[in-house]
Amino acid sequence: MAVTACQGLGFVVSLIGIAGIIAATCMDQWSTQDLYNNPVTAVFNYQGLWRSCVRESSGFTECRGYFTLLGLPAMLQAVRALMIVGIVLGAIGLLVSIFALKCIRIGSMEDSAKANMTLTSGIMFIVSGLCAIAGVSVFANMLVTNFWMSTANMYTGMGGMVQTVQTRYTFGAALFVGWVAGGLTLIGGVMMCIACRGLAPEETNYKAVSYHASGHSVAYKPGGFKASTGFGSNTKNKKIYDGGARTEDEVQSYPSKHDYV
């Protein structure tokens, strides 16, 4: 019961997380104009991964797509790639985890197969979450760097009499959505991996039992009951073949160096 709950919760949390990653990727407010130096502006700028927008105080908003690939900063391209990879992995993970859910019966699917699928989807969710967190963090780092560079430029040149106020950008709502969504996907993935332990039949080492036949004595040693993973309990005395799933020790986390802001 606890396994089913953990798996179900992991699925729901991951689903919310991936929906959040998709939302963040599509949002226009990755960076928003910093109003600290000009709180009374009648024109507000904000930018996303795919287009930049200008909202006038009159209420009119105009958005322009980035209609170039080669002319865009490499970092922006990298962030786009990370977010798309995160979405694709998450979507595949969701698809796999639907079939892996204990509450859903598909034909005569063995528990071991469900355990394998649960682990696979869990790893996919973890990597998906890491991709989203990495993408958002790279963008945030880029913003911080640009912010301080433009601040430095603001007070130099023309003997301090700068007429053109440089537009500085700060963190937009999409960054926070992305961080939270990535975290949720990551947590959902971990929960799926934990659920996998409970789903998998335990490796059972049966003691040799002597069966005394009426005629002559024969010692029968049942063997070959190697479970696909070393977790959970296998109450049924049936042969389970190794499906190639990883054990907990094999599950890799993918640490990556990020500049967190």
Epitope: T41, A42, N45, S52, V54, R64, Q163, Q166
Partner: antibody, heavy 118, light 113 residues
């Protein structure tokens, strides 16, 4: 077509208040900011403030803050500007104007002359 | 507040001739987000409310004759009437549409010589 029709001329004594109305027609009144502009006799234009009828949000020019009050009645598609503690320098024509793309004033009322005289 | 300075205060031009009005702002009106200048031009005839001519420094409002054109960027802007007509006699105002409070220039009176 878009029309902004303002109330008639007013003569007030110093220290009194005046409330000028601006009735809008021909567009969705709630969806556009309404601005108020002052023009003293033989002088230029001075922005007083603006109101968004949809939610009552207002922005004021610091020179008028505290003395000018902007309100709107969406059911009557009418915007109001009340100016209190009137003084002689408030004698002017007051215009209402719709705020449009490019943060410009695309349609204007005909103007209301407010005369402050003892 | 952004200060808008118009020059000249008045201008006398012969019919059919070119009239040029200048407007200078104390701060740049160029928005980096869309590369548009938030400067507006209005025409006001005696006894009438102002009429919108040009917004975004160079975009003519619908129904405005093409003899009116706006140019300039940043802090320096120009309104040009390529061939002055009798009906163009009016006071012309420039307006900062970039930062609150929205401010107007002092106006330029255009007359026929």
């Amino acid at each position: 077509q878009v029309q902004l029709v303002q109330s008639g001329a007013e003569v007030k004594k110093p220290g009194a208040s005046v409330k000028v109305s601006c009735k809008a027609s021909g567009y969705a009144f709630s969806n556009y900011w309404m601005n108020w502009v002052k023009q003293a006799p033989g002088q230029g234009l001075e922005w007083i403030g603006q109101i968004y009828p949809g939610n009552g949000d207002t922005k004021y020019n610091g020179n008028f803050k505290g003395r000018a009050t902007l309100t709107a009645d969406t059911s009557a598609s009418t915007a109001y500007m009340e100016l209190s503690s009137l003084r002689s320098e408030d004698t002017a024509v007051y215009f209402c104007a719709r705020y449009y793309r490019g943060n410009c004033f695309d349609y204007w009322g005909q103007g209301t002359l407010v005369t402050v005289s003892s | 507040d952004i200060v808008m300075t118009q020059s000249p205060d008045s201008l006398a031009v012969s019919l059919g001739e070119r009239a040029t009005i200048n407007c200078k702002s104390s701060q740049s009106l160029l928005n980096s987000g869309n590369q548009k200048n938030y400067l507006t031009w209005y025409q006001q005839k005696p006894g009438q409310p102002p009429k919108l001519l040009i917004y975004w420094a160079s975009t003519r409002d619908s129904g405005v004759p093409d003899r009116f054109s706006g140019s300039g960027s940043g802090t320096d802007f120009t309104l040009t009437i390529s061939s002055l007509q009798a009906e163009d006699v009016a006071v012309y105002y420039c307006q900062n549409a970039y930062t609150y409070p929205l401010t107007f220039g002092g106006g330029t009176k255009v007359e026929i010589k």
